[in-house]
């Protein structure tokens, strides 16, 4: 006999990266008929919602009107049908941004390169932080972590046209509190690739520095259970 229900899906709208003092909604999607949803923050009960009527609702929303560093951290949710509780959802890392200062992002040898050239991004911030994050904007947000006293370098290695795009970086004061974003840097990669082995469908990055794909609401795929299950936002752990 089943002792627990399938885990719900958790995500943040409009994004898991929330500028301080801005609003964010944490969404938890379980099953129709769930009479209670619980949101947990850093392992403790944070909020409860009891949908009405439960048989017509399979998703609840927990609204945070004013994001700050105390609200940043790891969230999960569970739901109950009758007396039976679900497994906990994957962890959602909610990050507060626009804290303190703005880093500077640059790219060497330049913003326009030939496919196959080595490219390195540099993120610099003169205030007290030692962790930096590089994000590529778009359908899926790649996040790479780097370390350094005032500057971190992010070597992409030989680039392909898949590396084209707009990049920003952040200084990280802790796992869930990030600086203002840098000004964007648009990387253009030109040149036809003769060696197709150099042109993966998506850029490849060092496994130890790149987190999982972080799907944002712009993908329109939040409701794809299998996909969200597979792409849980566990970057920062």
């Amino acid at each position: 006999q089943q002792q627990t229900l399938p885990k719900p899906f958790i995500w943040a709208e409009p994004h898991f990266m929330v500028p301080k003092e801005k609003q964010v909604t944490i969404c938890c999607q379980g099953n129709y008929g769930a009479v209670e949803y619980q949101l947990h923050f850093e392992g403790s009960l944070f909020a409860v919602d009891r949908p009405k009527p439960p048989e017509r609702i399979n998703k609840v929303q927990f609204y945070i009107p004013d994001m700050n560093s105390r609200m940043a951290g790891q969230y999960s949710c569970i739901y109950r049908v009758g007396e039976l509780w679900s497994e906990p959802s994957n962890l959602l890392d909610l990050v507060v941004t626009e804290m303190y200062d703005t880093p500077t992002l640059s790219v060497h040898p330049g913003p326009e390169v030939i496919s196959g050239e080595k490219v390195t991004f540099y993120c610099r911030l003169d205030t007290a932080t030692s962790m930096f994050l590089l994000l590529k904007e778009g359908r899926s947000s790649h996040v790479q972590r780097g370390y350094g006293k005032v500057q971190a370098e992010f070597p992409l290695g030989p680039v392909t046209t898949a590396h084209r795009g707009t990049y920003r970086c952040f200084g990280s004061y802790n796992n869930h509190a990030w600086s203002f974003p840098s000004e964007p840097v648009k990387l253009l990669v030109t040149g036809d690739i003769e060696n197709t082995s150099l042109a993966p469908e998506d850029p490849t990055f060092p496994a130890d520095t790149w987190g999982t794909y972080l799907l944002t609401t712009e993908t329109g795929l939040q409701k794809d259970h299998a996909l969200w299950d597979h792409t849980a936002q566990n970057l920062l752990r």
Epitope: S106, H108, P109, G110, P111, E112, V113, I114, S115, G116, E117, K118, V119, T120, P158, T160, L188, T190, G191, D192, I193, E194, N195, L198
Partner: antibody, heavy 118, light 107 residues
Framework: EVQLQQSGAEVKKPGSSVKVSCKTS????????MHWVRQAPGKSLEWFGG????????SYNQKFKGRATLTVDKSSSTAYMELSSLRSEDTAVYYC???????????WGQGTTVTVSS | DIVLTQSPATLSLSPGERATLSCRAS??????LHWFQQKPHESPRLLIK???QSISGIPARFSGSGSGSDFTLTISSLEPEDFAVYYC?????????FGPGTKVDIK
């Protein structure tokens, strides 16, 4: 020691083609892109195009696209620049230059003089 | 294309004097601006990268400044071997372009 050794001077007729070589040594050829820059007599420098030996990817100055071809031979660590349909305005010194991924053109060949004259 | 304008076209100075060379870009190129020196019958030589960063082996009297669209190369005290043509180069986007050059000659 990094060295870029270019082929010798060429005298060509209008309408013909020229192929200049740039043999490299002292570094890993596939790690740096190779660019070509030309300089007409008494004039400034003009970027011709670049090629990544790693991928074969190229980028050309649109001014020369269609007439220019950049290639590499990885086995001999040599880069080539070919320019077709030559005209008198193509008379110049042609340089190969390595593009460092942390700066710009850090090493240059000695230059190859191409004279186009009927 | 990014057009680079250099001024003055010619700078006539004496050894020991300070030389200030200007380079202006037709649009903002952040700090993706490099400086080269070229002497007669020689290949260009990289002097300054990314507007202000020094190059190993280049004398400390050469320095660069600027960002966006206005850049300056300064030679603090001219040595006899510094009389040459100086080019700025756009490293921001293709086509990579060079300025027309500033000739520093002996007064």
């Amino acid at each position: 020691e990094v060295q870029l050794q270019q082929s010798g001077a060429e005298v060509k007729k209008p309408g013909s083609s020229v192929k200049v070589s740039c043999k490299t040594s002292g570094y890993t050829f596939t790690e740096y892109s190779m660019h070509w820059v030309r300089q007409a007599p008494g004039k400034s420098l003009e970027w011709f195009g670049g090629i990544s030996p790693n991928s074969g990817g190229t980028s050309y100055n649109q001014k020369f696209k269609g007439r220019a071809t950049l290639t590499v031979d990885k086995s001999s660590s040599t880069a080539y620049m070919e320019l077709s349909s030559l005209r008198s305005e193509d008379t110049a010194v042609y340089y190969c230059a390595r593009r460092d991924f942390h700066s710009s053109f850090d090493y240059w060949g000695q230059g190859t003089t191409v004279t186009v004259s009927s | 294309d990014i057009v680079l304008t250099q001024s003055p076209a010619t700078l006539s100075l004496s050894p020991g004097e300070r030389a200030t060379l200007s380079c202006r870009a037709s649009q903002s190129i952040s700090d993706y601006l490099h400086w080269f020196q070229q002497k007669p019958h020689e290949s260009p030589r990289l002097l300054i990268k990314y507007a202000s960063q020094s190059i190993s082996g280049i004398p400390a009297r050469f320095s660069g400044s600027g960002s966006g669209s206005d850049f300056t190369l300064t030679i603090s005290s001219l040595e006899p071997e510094d009389f040459a043509v100086y080019y700025c180069q756009n490293g921001h986007s293709f086509p990579l372009t060079f300025g027309p050059g500033t000739k520093v000659d002996i007064k």
